[in-house]
């Protein structure tokens, strides 16, 4: 009787195993093993047992022990099962961006791996199993369909093989494919909204705003803004599912005419675009010309207004006669004209829009100085110890410097609240000076002081105010 040990072996591909062939008779004529595998006999004492090392086991094999005894010939087989993990576990390539709502087919291919009865293919989203099937065929292929949702964005899909040899006393061997990261997106069918000036003036800046709602993921959206060949550099502000791209656009004389403004939004592998036309025009402000911006009182002044040849002007609200790009007016300068604004308004039609430009010039009329009774009274009479504010206003352009001096040296504090004392009394020479000349005016301050009179035999006090006035002959003096 021939026996073999072990009768069943599971071993890794390319591995080795020791097989013992035994016979029940003491003196077998023959004892051996039949196998295509490389073998090496290990020497043992006795005739009824032989041990062989079988090496480089690449596939399942059934080596057979045989013996020839006096009572006849017999055989025994050992079953070698080779295990190995797949050589390739791969997800079929897919575009990384997938629109939400689309059916996505995931296909996993597995090459190799044994024993196949113990090999399972699993499709996963993250750690969640989507499908589990035994590996069948070479290559084995497992597919599943996923309806793309927003919350799949950034999810990792993978394929895993499981070679479960735990029933054979070994472990669970896992192989995982490279993950496929899904990028989901929503790009609405509506084109982006583009807000920009319809007309834009040369050498100015305009603001262009391109916006779109209902995007996902909004942060991944690319916005391209361009005016003609000029690429704009927008500042993009994001909302939950919207963006607003704001850019400044500068135009020069070379851009004059009609230009195409485009806003393109690219998300995933889709895009939406909006086009608009912008008319770039040149319209300098009208020119207000004064014969002289600064004139003395009584001077004849000509005010001219000149604008763009196609413009229509009004000067100080009066339209040009005939209606056109030029207007003028004449005047004799008076103090009331000082600071008077001459405003020229020009209107030009551009692409159906009326463009208005204004230019204002101010006339300076030099006059004065002036000191008159109304604004600088010549006489003040104040009670002693009262609080008073001497007022004297000089007029003129430029505004005159005003000082009122008594005896050429002592100032009267104009516009200040003063306590009236005897020292304040007297005649002050008020002098207003400017580059236009000077005027002087005498101002007399009278101080009323109480005179005390004793009654007959009584101590009664009669407060009788007595005006005391001292006149000084003043020269043209000026002092601080």
């Amino acid at each position: 009787q021939t026996s073999v040990s072990p009768s069943k072996v599971i071993l890794p591909r390319g591995g080795s195993v020791l097989v013992t062939c035994s016979t029940s008779c003491d003196q077998p004529k023959l004892l051996g093993i039949e196998t295509p595998l490389p073998k090496k006999e290990l020497l043992l004492p006795g005739n009824n047992r032989k041990v062989y090392e079988l090496s480089n086991v690449q596939e399942d094999s059934q080596p057979m022990c045989y013996s020839n005894c006096p009572d006849g010939q017999s055989t025994a087989k050992t079953f070698l099962t080779v295990y190995w993990t797949p050589e390739r576990v791969e997800l079929a390539p897919l575009p990384s961006w997938q629109p939400v709502g689309k059916n996505l087919t995931l296909r996993c291919q597995v090459e190799g791996g044994a024993p196949r009865a113990n090999l399972t293919v699993v499709l996963l989203r993250g750690e969640k199993e989507l499908k589990r099937e035994p590996a069948v065929g070479e290559p084995a292929e497992v597919t599943t369909t996923v309806l793309v949702r927003r919350d799949h964005h950034g999810a990792n899909f993978s394929c895993r093989t499981e070679l479960d040899l735990r029933p054979q006393g070994l472990e669970l061997f896992e192989n995982t494919s490279a993950p496929y990261q899904l990028q989901t997106f929503v790009l609405p069918a509506t084109p982006p909204q583009l807000v920009s000036p319809r007309v834009l003036e040369v050498d100015t800046q305009g603001t262009v705003v391109c916006s779109l709602d209902g995007l996902f993921p909004v942060s991944e959206a690319q916005v391209h803004l361009a005016l003609g060949d000029q690429r704009l550099n927008p500042t993009v502000t994001y909302g939950n599912d919207s963006f607003s791209a704001k850019a400044s656009v500068s135009v020069t004389a070379e851009d004059e005419g009609t230009q195409r403004l485009t806003c393109a939004v690219i998300l995933g592998n889709q895009s939406q675009e909006t086009l608009q036309t912008v008319t770039i025009y040149s319209f300098p402000a009208p020119n207000v010309i004064l014969t002289k911006p600064e004139v003395s009182e009584g001077t004849e002044v000509t005010v001219k207004c000149e604008a763009h040849p196609r413009a229509k002007v009004t000067l100080n609200g009066v339209p040009a006669q005939p209606l056109g790009p030029r207007a003028q007016l004449l005047l004799k300068a008076t103090p009331e004209d000082n600071g008077r604004s001459f405003s020229c308004s020009a209107t030009l039609e551009v692409a159906g829009q009326l463009i208005h430009k204004n230019q204002t010039r101010e006339l300076r009329v030099l006059y004065g100085p002036r000191l008159d009774e109304r604004d600088c009274p010549g006489n003040w009479t104040w009670p002693e110890n009262s609080q008073q504010t001497p007022m004297c206003q000089a007029w003129g352009n430029p505004l005159p410097e005003l000082k009122c001096l008594k005896d050429g040296t002592f100032p009267l504090p104009i516009g200040e609240s003063v306590t009236v004392t005897r020292d304040l009394e007297g005649t002050y020479l008020c002098r207003a000076r400017s580059t236009q000349g000077e005027v002087t005016r005498k101002v007399t301050v009278n101080v009323l002081s109480p005179r005390y009179e004793g009654g007959s035999g009584g101590s009664g006090l009669n407060d009788i105010f007595e005006a005391q006035k001292i006149e000084w002959h003043e020269e043209n003096l000026y002092f601080q």
Epitope: D407, T409, F410, P411, P413, H473, L477, Y478, F479
Partner: antibody, heavy 120, light 110 residues
Framework: EVQVLESGGGLVQPGGSLRLSCAVS????????MGWVRQAPGKGLEWIGI???????YYASWAKGRFTISKDNSKNTVYLQINSPRAEDTAVYYC??????????????WGQGTLVTVSS | DIQMTQSPSTLSASVGDRVTITCQAS??????LSWYQQKPGKAPKFLIY???KLASGVPSRFSGSGSGTEFTLTISSVQPDDFATYYC????????????FGGGTKVEIK
Amino acid sequence: EVQVLESGGGLVQPGGSLRLSCAVSGFSLSSHAMGWVRQAPGKGLEWIGIIGSSDRTYYASWAKGRFTISKDNSKNTVYLQINSPRAEDTAVYYCVRDPYDSYDDGYRLWGQGTLVTVSS
Amino acid sequence: DIQMTQSPSTLSASVGDRVTITCQASQSIYRYLSWYQQKPGKAPKFLIYDASKLASGVPSRFSGSGSGTEFTLTISSVQPDDFATYYCQQAYSSGSIDNAFGGGTKVEIK
């Protein structure tokens, strides 16, 4: 050119009398008040008094009586009379043109001063 | 009587420092205050009138402020030429005054 120039300083004996002169040029005395200021050696400035354009005079309280300011418009000269000088009157005496504004010469005019030494 | 009180009497500063001198009048002199600079052996030089107006030729680092009884002279960044004695003077009243000038402030090199 606008100028003021003091003269008359020097050594004077206590109890005597002294008159300092201030000659002005480039402006009229009738249109400016003129003042006198003194400075004792190592001390601060001390206001003595002023003569107004009307010839009226104003003095510091300590100067009343011994000091007299006068002027002669025709000679364009201002004077300071010191009666009974004392050792404490030893000082540099400055003549000052008083009025000032932005249309004047751009500075208040001071002379270079004249030194009076009272000593026996 | 109007008395003029100046402080401090002495002030030590380095080139580039900001310096402030104050002058107090015993009663209101409104804005009628002048500032002078004096160097040893020289006549005083007029700096500021009407409390804050710069006399012509005076550098803009000098400035004056105040009205009524409190006045200030400021040198924003002291230069070597600014080490001198500074005086304030009231130019308002002549009524029984002892001295129209403050006692002076000597600005010396630290």
